[in-house]
Interface confidence: medium
């Protein structure tokens, strides 16, 4: 008869650090022997190869040495597959390919996740609050998989949606932070909860504040945006937060929103009689439009460039008008400092080095500190250099001359200055007479 | 013994569409084996276009047919069916069943072939 | 896909000889077959992984190679071998692919 694969048709969930199986199996027929059988386990999208099993051997890992079959299993029909320690970068679909005679093949997803920490509540201004001051607070939640789900809510658990600006930051192993930070103008008192939800796990981390202002609130109808700059990294999107606050009867009919480049009043994007007029801006614009109508006039700005930097002016009008600019800064991170010395061998103490510390495609120019391996900072002879490439991003070189003494370490440090994203990399040069590199 | 028998092919004018041959199977058990479709283009070249397992669950495609050609069985008739759309001059060749054998990925045995031409 | 360089293209050789066609493709771990496609178009398989002779195949067909290099050697060469014949890698999922062929004429 023909031959059955079978694996589960929901992802299968794993924590991360965890291992996880990767169900897979198959009806061998009557006389079946492990010679007979060709199992491949494969990425589905790369088609990169994981694992296999042929010739009645078992093939290996071809996996990060990572994954392993069940042996003892495989003449029952049991493909499956062991994958430890899993990591973010697992997440993915993989296929599972049986061959004796006929084959077949299908493929199962592996949905990675970790849970979120119990969130932390700051509040700015936090003090002397009166009834309608705005105040912003941010809660944040660390080293979860996947992205988040935020949500705010007032006291009577009434959902906030407006004025909330949610960043999440993946580190190296693609774990996220999350800050979420909703602006609000105070009322004569008030609880504000912050719930951070692993949509994967269905794991809820909640936190809240209560504000208690001391008078009661006087406020007037006006267009919002984020005081501070938007910082949005190369090549993603970023959204430029604008609110409006419609009088009851508002309909988008009535609505004229204009987008536009502060400084050279450039169009951007624009919405009137009741239409989205499109993006006048590269096409990488775009209106979150089920949400206009709760004044929502938020700009959504696609695979962010350094040359989209700058202030975005958001114009609502609708009987009255009223504007403000949201500033756009653009970040990119910068590489590992590189280290280089010259000259690289036969040093001797009192010999003049010179170590250039390198590091690339950051955004915007780097702060570039030396110091030496007791922490004290190195400031004569340094000479750095800057050099932007066609996209904007800037290389750094940074020089540093030093007299020799007996051993030292010299550290150079490469700060993003909007990104606080500090790279270091350092030399130690010991011995006498010394090479660089160290050899083993 | 194992015999593929071909029918179908012909001429066809660019952009049009054709459910190209069917390949009658005989002397094994049909639903048993995966099938493909493999094509020989006029330099002689030999590309797999497209393959379906025994029950027909899963199907492959060459990238350069994926999204024009629909391979499918009748394992109750004993038949392989191409059915190609979009047509381009490109897919001028001779095309061939194949049976396709298991843990070695190879074609034991292959029908006779049918032409088809794409052109104006 | 793998691609699947094989040689020579053509080749000439006398009836009795012992004639040898390679196959060259990135490491297929041994998943690779031969086949012979007389002038009237007719198709065959000859070996498969590598070395297995299919069977009512003579056994002046034999096959060999391993990783990335793989041949055909015909030892004793008669009239009825003169063909094109091909490899096809059958490593991973389909789509498999093909070499480009060897046309063997008799001088």
């Known amino acids: 008869g023909a031959l059955e694969v079978q694996v589960p048709e929901d992802p299968v969930v794993a924590l991360v650090g965890t291992d996880a199986t990767l169900c897979c199996s198959f009806s061998p027929e009557p006389g079946f022997s492990l010679a007979q059988l060709n199992l491949i386990w494969q990425l589905t999208d790369t088609k990169q190869l994981v694992h296999s099993f042929a010739e009645g051997q078992d093939q290996g890992s071809a996996y990060a040495n990572r994954t392993a079959l069940f042996p003892d299993l495989l003449a029952q029909g049991n493909a499956s597959l062991r994958l430890q320690r899993v990591r973010v970068a697992d997440e993915g679909s993989f296929t599972c390919f049986v061959s004796i005679r006929d084959f077949g093949s299908a493929a199962v997803s592996l949905q990675v996740a970790a849970p979120y920490s119990k969130p932390s509540m700051t509040l700015e201004p936090n003090k002397d609050l009166r009834p309608g001051d705005t105040v912003t607070i941010t809660c944040s939640s660390y080293q979860g998989y996947p992205e988040a789900e935020v949500f705010w809510q007032d006291g009577q658990g009434v959902p906030l949606t407006g004025n909330v600006t949610t960043s999440q930051m993946a580190n190296e192993q693609g774990l996220f932070d999350v800050h979420s930070i909703l602006r609000v103008v105070l009322g004569a008192n008030g609880t504000y909860s912050c719930l951070v939800r692993n949509p994967v796990l269905q794991q809820d981390a909640h936190s809240s504040v209560t504000i208690t202002p001391q008078r009661s609130p006087t406020g007037a109808v006006e267009v919002q945006v984020p005081e501070d700059p938007v910082v949005a990294l190369v090549g993603t999107d970023a959204t430029l937060r604008c609110s409006f606050s419609p009088e009851p009867g508002f309909s988008l009919a009535q609505l004229n929103l204009i987008w536009q480049l502060t400084d050279t009043k450039q169009l951007v994007h624009s919405f009137t009689e009741g239409r989205d007029q499109g993006s006048a801006y590269a096409n990488r614009t775009a209106l979150f439009p089920d949400l206009l109508a709760q004044g929502n006039a938020s700009l959504r700005l696609q695979r962010v460039r350094v040359a989209d930097e700058g202030s975005f002016t958001c114009f609502v009008s609708i009987r009255d008008f009223g504007s403000a600019a949201v500033s756009l800064q653009v970040a990119a991170p910068y590489s590992k400092p590189s280290m280089t010395l010259e000259p690289n061998k036969d040093l001797r103490p009192g010999d003049t080095v010179t170590i250039t510390c390198s590091s690339y495609r950051g955004y915007p120019e780097a702060e570039v500190f030396w110091q030496d391996g007791q922490g004290v900072p190195l400031t004569g002879n340094v000479t750095t250099s800057q050099m932007a490439n066609e996209q904007g991003l800037f290389d750094v070189h940074s020089v540093l001359r030093v007299v020799l003494g007996a051993n030292g370490t010299y550290s150079c440090l490469v700060r993003n200055p909007v990104l606080q994203q500090d790279a270091h990399g350092s030399v130690t040069i010991t011995g006498q007479p010394m090479t660089f590199p160290p050899e083993a | 013994q194992v015999q593929l028998q071909q029918s179908g092919g012909g001429l066809v004018q660019p952009g049009g569409s054709l459910k190209l041959s069917s390949c009658a199977a005989s002397g094994f058990t049909f639903s048993s084996y995966g099938m493909s479709w493999v094509r020989q283009t006029p330099d002689k070249r030999l590309e797999l276009v497209a393959t379906?397992?025994?029950?027909?669950?899963?199907?492959y495609y060459s990238d350069s047919v994926k999204g024009r050609f629909t391979i499918s069985r009748d394992n109750a008739k004993n038949t392989l069916y191409l059915q190609m759309s979009s047509l381009k001059s490109e897919d001028t060749a001779m095309y061939y069943c194949a049976r396709s054998y298991g843990n070695y990925h190879y074609f034991d045995y292959w029908g006779q072939g049918t032409t088809l031409t794409v052109s104006s | 896909d793998i691609v699947m360089t094989q040689s020579p293209s053509s080749l000439s050789a006398s009836l009795g000889d012992r004639v040898t066609i390679s196959c060259r493709a990135s490491?297929?771990?041994?998943?690779l077959n031969w086949y012979q496609q007389k002038p009237d178009g007719t198709v065959k398989l000859l070996i498969y992984y590598t070395s297995r002779l299919h069977s009512g195949v003579p056994s002046r067909f034999s096959g060999s190679g391993s990783g990335t290099d793989y041949s055909l050697t015909i030892s004793n060469l008669e009239q009825e071998d003169i063909a094109t014949y091909f490899c096809q890698q059958g490593n991973t999922l389909p789509p498999w692919t093909f070499g480009g062929g060897t046309k063997l004429e008799i001088k």
């Open positions: 379906i397992n025994g029950n027909g669950g899963n199907t």
């Open positions: 490491d297929i771990r041994n998943y």
